[in-house]
Every structure is written in C-alpha cells, then in structure tokens.
C-alpha cells in the first residue's frame, strides 16, 4: 500500500483557494468502511474522515469553515484537501495520512505569497525647499525591496526612508518615500522588488503640472481677499446705520402734523 | 524518560460506563500519538485507539461506537470511555505511545485489571 | 483487519537452547516507503507490562540483548533467541503496524525446562 502525492510543493496566493492531493491505490469500488483520511499541518487537525464519517470536533479551530475533504474525489484514490481564502498561517508542511488495507502517509509542503500588487502613491511639496516628496504604500509577503527608478529606469539619489509594519492578516505593509528635486512631468517609478520571477510591481509617479507650485502663498491670497470682504461688508453696515441715525434726527427736528404722517415716515423708514 | 500510569476502578457493574485515566511524565501529549491497548484472560492483545498530539482519534471498528479517548493537555493526561460495559470485557488496560504514525509501542503502562461483574 | 498467526501457543526448552518463533501475516507488511516490514516483537514477563524488543522485523530496540535476532520479510517473520536464559521466560507477540487497526499475535508462551 502506497500513498504519492502528484506534487510536494504548492506555492500559493493569499486569499486565494488551494487543493493539495495524495493518490492512493483503489481497486474497483471503494469500500468507505475501511478507509481513514487524515490530513494535518504540523500541530493542528485538518480532517479526520475515518470510515465514512468527517469529524469537525477535532478539527483546528483556524481551518473551521474553510477546509474540506473532496469526498466525490475518495473513489477515484484521490485524498484532495480544498482550502479556501489562504492565510498566511496557511504555509507549511501537510501530511496525508490513509490506511485502507495498508496505511501510508506522505508530506506535501504549502508557501504562501502575497504580491504587492496594489500599491497606494502619494506627491507632496516642501514649500521650504520645493522638494518632491514621493510616497509609494503596498501590502505583501514576503519582504519587499522598493526600488525608485526615473523615465530612464535608472536609479534616483535622494533621501529615502522605508517603514514596515504587519496588517491584521499577518501581511507586511511596506511604505517608501523618496524626497527629490523635480520639476513638473518628471517620471518616477516605485517597484516592490522580489527575487521570484514575476514577483516585481511597479507604479507610475507623475509630478503634477502646476501642483500650486506656492500652495502656502496661494492659501494667503484667498486670506486676504476674505479679509477685504469682510471689512467692506463691516463698513457698508456701518454707513448704513449712520444714515438710519441722521433721517431718525430729521424727523425729530420737524415735528409731527398728524398720526397717519408718523405712521407713513416709520413704514418708509422701515422699508428703506 | 517517558512513564505512564494508569489509573481507575477495577471493578464496573454491567452496563455501566469504565473510564481511566493514563498520565503521562517525561514527554508531552502535545507530541506523538496516545493508544489503549487491552489483554484478555487468555492472553489475547486487542488495539482500541489511539489519541494523537493533534487531537485526532482513531478508534478500533470492533468497539463500535462504545469507544471515546479525550485528553487534558494542561495535566499531561488522556483519558479512555468505554460505554456499555458487558463481562467481555474484562481485561487488563493498557496505555502504550509511539511516536510516529506508523510505529511500534515502545512505550507501555503497567496495566490495571478491570473486572465487569454484577 | 489483517490477521496474525503464531506457532506453537507454548514452548518448553532447555536453558542455553537455541529457539525460533514463528509469526505470519494474512497479507504482506512491506512498508514501501522504506521497504522493510512493519512488524513488532514484544516480551511480556509474568506481571509486567509488554516490552518492545524487534521493529521493522529486524531492528532490535536500544537495550535489549543480541541474542534477540528478528527476520522474515512480506507475510513470514521468526524471533531468534539464539542462547536462552532463565530471564527469557515469557510470552512473546508479533503485532503489525502496517494498517489500521493495529493487530496483535495470539502469543507464544516460552517455559523453561
């Protein structure tokens, strides 16, 4: 009795879904009655199929919902364990462990990547040294080298930092920033460099056309004209009320003829 | 090295439950796999299951489903239940460990007799 | 389940004598990732416990004497004791590791003369 696995090594994506298969030899029909499935990853429990039953007790609490033995799959000799949405917790070394007549266990090592596909850019300005600050941010595993090149795709001096951090989900969230002096439409790229082949992501860095080249100056100007304004309309309310003063005065000095005369003069006045 | 000791009554009442207990000093459970074995007057070895450091159980088809073995990691102990005791199985039990999946007992307790009588 | 069968039940012999026990399996124990055979002896002493001495039909256990030999291969395995001591008295089991659930011999008691 024999176990073989088709592969020994997956290599697979973060959040994506995963099979991983042991043969074993099945002479016509397949008598569920004596066949024990078990597949696990180093300390914890993935399957324990024995004699036709799955038992979810037993089961590891970090695969409950997404693990699962292909049943349809058993008749055929194939003990395929499906995983969906991968985790970085996810990579290691699996054993398929069957008996059926005789028992064999085979190891069936899992790696995880998670490209640093989507990667966030950010262009701010110095306004002390008109310096471009260039800001590129992506999520992945494993570590990524970030590579600042220019439309030539050669290097770029300038000062540059990187900072690391982990996500909820275990992924490395890289940010780089380079600070440079440039001038508008200069090209910039960031790469998330990895020494697998196909493993490398770019992003394409634009310096704006007029990213307010003086955006602090800018910012004085709506100032000042708000300033205007509000003095002008100070003003304006001012005169105003002098003037209600001086007619107020008017009437007084003149004296009043009769009732509907004052009540006329108050609803002009009023409506003025 | 590793010891194991089994403990629990060694007289049961038909149909009552037996339940045992094997601790375990010198290696942990978390590690290896975790058996009862038993021995009938006569001299007859029987395999009944095993425990293993992942949690998972195998259970011998010849118990049915009488046959339950849980652990207690924090004491370094596991556990064997059998249901619906009856006079056969009278024997004494044994715990044992390997450390491999596929591997010999290399292992053993010294046995405890239980005896099934009213 | 895969059925082991020992010869003779019982044995009496002499001290010094040299003596083969016989075990047989009803289908082969020929582990293929290793291609040895996955069969036990153990020793059981009178009121002790069970005590491993062959693996892999021919691996003798750390500790026990070199006058304890195991052969055979497939379906056919003999335990050896090649010069037996008053010690040796006791019962003597194959038991296969080869498939779940595990099987044991029906023992082969040696007495001595």
């Known amino acids: 009795f024999t176990v073989t696995v088709p592969k020994d090594l997956y290599v697979v994506e973060y959040g994506s879904n995963m099979t991983i298969e042991c043969k074993f030899p099945v002479e016509k029909q397949l008598d569920l009655a004596a066949l024990i499935v078990y597949w696990e990853m180093e300390d914890k429990n993935i399957i324990q199929f024995v004699h036709g039953e799955e038992d979810l007790k037993v089961q590891h609490s970090s695969y409950r919902q997404r693990a699962r033995l292909l049943k349809d799959q058993l008749s055929l000799g194939n003990a395929a364990l499906q995983i969906t949405d991968v985790k970085l917790q996810d990579a290691g070394v699996y054993r398929c462990m069957i008996s059926y007549g005789g028992a064999d266990y085979k190891r069936i090592t899992v790696k995880v990547n998670a490209p640093y596909r989507k990667i966030n850019q950010r262009i701010s300005v110095d306004p002390a040294t008109s310096e471009h600050e260039l800001i590129c941010q992506a999520e992945g595993y494993p570590e990524a080298e970030v590579i600042w090149t220019n439309s030539d795709h050669q290097p770029v001096s300038g000062k540059r930092s990187v900072t690391t951090s982990r996500t909820e989900g275990m992924l490395l969230n890289v940010t780089s920033s380079l600070r440079v002096n440039a001038t508008a439409n200069d090209v910039f790229y960031c790469t998330f460099w990895r020494s697998q082949p196909g493993q490398n992501h770019t992003a394409e860095l634009i310096i704006p056309e007029l990213p307010a080249t003086h955006p602090p100056q800018n910012r004085t100007h709506w100032v000042l004209l708000g300033s205007i304004l509000l003095f002008l309309i100070v003003v304006s309310t001012v005169l105003l009320f002098l003037r209600k003063q001086v007619r107020m005065l008017d009437v007084e000095k003149c004296g009043v003829e009769d009732t509907s005369s004052k009540n006329r003069n108050d609803t002009q006045f009023e409506e003025t | 090295e590793v010891q194991l000791q089994e403990s629990g009554p060694s007289l049961v009442k038909p149909s009552q439950t037996l339940s045992l207990t094997c601790s375990v000093t010198?290696?942990?459970?978390?590690?290896?796999?975790w058996n009862w074995i038993r021995k009938f007057p006569g001299n007859k070895l029987e395999y009944m299951g095993y425990?293993?450091?992942?949690?998972?159980?195998y259970y011998n088809p010849s118990l049915k489903s009488r046959f339950s073995i849980t652990r207690d990691t924090s004491k370094n102990q596991y556990f064997l239940q059998l249901n619906s005791v009856t006079t056969e199985d009278t024997a004494t039990y044994y715990c044992?460990?390997?450390?491999?999946?596929?591997?010999?007992?290399?292992?053993w307790g010294q046995g405890t007799l239980v005896t099934v009588s009213a | 389940d895969i059925v082991m069968s020992q010869s003779p039940s019982s044995l009496a012999v002499s001290v010094g004598e040299k003596v083969p026990l016989s075990c047989k399996s009803s289908q082969s124990l020929l582990y293929s990732s290793n291609q040895k055979s996955s069969l036990a002896w153990y020793q059981q002493k009178p009121g002790q416990s069970p005590k491993l001495l062959i693996y892999w039909a021919s691996t003798r256990e750390s500790g026990v004497p070199d006058r304890f030999t195991g052969s055979g291969s497939g379906t056919d395995f003999t335990l050896t004791i090649s010069s037996v001591k008053a010690e040796d008295l006791a019962v003597y089991y194959c038991?296969?590791?080869?498939?779940?659930?595990?099987?044991f011999g029906s023992g082969t008691k040696l007495e001595i003369k």
């Open positions: 010198g290696d942990s459970i978390t590690s290896g796999y």
């Open positions: 044992a460990s390997y450390e491999g999946w596929l591997l010999p007992f290399a292992y």
């Open positions: 425990i293993s450091y992942t949690g998972s159980t």
């Open positions: 038991q296969q590791y080869y498939g779940y659930p595990f099987t």
